[in-house]
Interface confidence: low
Amino acid sequence: LQDLCSNCPAGTFCDNNRSQICSPCPPNSFSSAGGQRTCDICRQCKGVFKTRKECSSTSNAECDCISGYHCLGAECSMCEQDCKQGQELTKKGCKDCCFGTFNDQKRGICRPWTNCSLDGKSVLVNGTKERDVVCGPSPADLSPGASSATPPAPAREPGHSPQ
């Protein structure tokens, strides 16, 4: 009996109710391999999902995300709102960095601005949601011939965890 089922090709299922005849998958279902006893229900691309590839008798539908969203998870199992610099990805989507933090990357989270005073320096350029502050010499260090300040290396460590 098992051998009869193994002859059923993709796009069909082995119908036990009909003496193990190979029956075509019903509408909105598929079997991607031979010898299947049932066909799987086709994925439906609804809401923030849009159909990239229609379901066929041998392959599942494939989804993309609508404009303004991007795919997350294996096989585009989720759609997440597009992020940009000055935001962080949280479980609730993309959120603006809080005051005093920044994110200049597409990944990761908002990190605190550098505290220039810890190094005895002053703020040369204020920070934004997208950029860290630029520290300059302390007022006492300012003198003719003093070298111009250079931006600090971007911080790598997260400042806080997304909520």
Partner: antibody, heavy 118, light 108 residues
């Protein structure tokens, strides 16, 4: 079916250059970030570089910064890695992978071996 | 950079036994950004778990992931012969993206 096929690996002398390619099929290439990840013989995995869907934003591991350049041609569904000033420590199998950003790398190529030796 | 330390380095078990693999981060990582991979000799890595606990497409339910903060775990409830391989954790919480050094699960 999603497929990633790397090519361009081979034997090169220290200081030399190579250009790796990764041909993508089975998905909307222009919608996804892509990455290169390498694995030295008998060692673990090391992320090398990534590129956003439009090719405008790239990032690199410190170990390759200034020597490697990632790029993509969405019209050809192909990812590239230009490797210059190669060193012995760059010897590895180089994989291209579809990058889901937060959720890891869901599809990988079979890899192409780069050997840097005199 | 975030350093991921996996333990043990090698796990010697028999088919049917339970495997517990650990991944510890040098600093807190949001669970959304933690993934696990399986790699067999001569093959590319395969995504098993993303978001610390969600199984990737086609991954059997004997694989499960858990954890948060700095401590994450991959559990294989009953080892099958095809599960003997090297397993890596990976974070994409902040640049550079990093992997653990791997845990080899070998047949006892």
């Amino acid at each position: 079916e999603v497929q990633l096929l790397e090519s361009g690996g081979g034997l090169v002398q220290p200081g030399g250059s190579l250009r790796l390619s990764c041909a993508a099929s089975g998905f909307t290439f222009s919608s996804y970030d892509m990455s290169w990840v390498r694995q030295a013989p008998g060692k673990g995995l090391e992320w090398v570089s990534d590129i956003d869907p439009t090719g405008s934003k790239t990032d690199y591991a410190d170990s390759v910064k200034g020597r490697f350049t990632i790029s993509r041609d969405n019209s050809k569904n192909t990812l590239y890695l230009q490797m210059n000033s190669l060193r012995a420590e760059d010897t590895a199998v180089y994989y291209c992978a579809r990058d889901l950003l937060v959720y890891g790398f869901d599809y990988w190529g079979q890899g192409t071996l780069v050997t840097v030796s005199s | 950079e975030i350093v991921l330390t996996q333990s043990p380095g090698t796990l010697s078990l028999s088919p049917g036994e339970r495997a517990t693999l650990s991944c510890r981060a040098s600093q807190s990582v949001s669970s959304s950004y933690l993934a696990w991979y399986q790699q067999k000799p001569g093959q590319a890595p395969r995504l098993l778990i993303y978001g610390a606990s969600s199984r990737a497409t086609g991954i059997p339910d004997r694989f499960s992931g858990s954890g948060s903060g700095t401590d994450f775990t991959l559990t294989i409830s009953r080892l099958e012969p095809e599960d003997f391989a090297v397993y890596y954790c990976q974070q994409s919480y902040s640049y550079p993206v990093t992997f653990g050094q791997g845990t080899k699960v070998e047949i006892k």
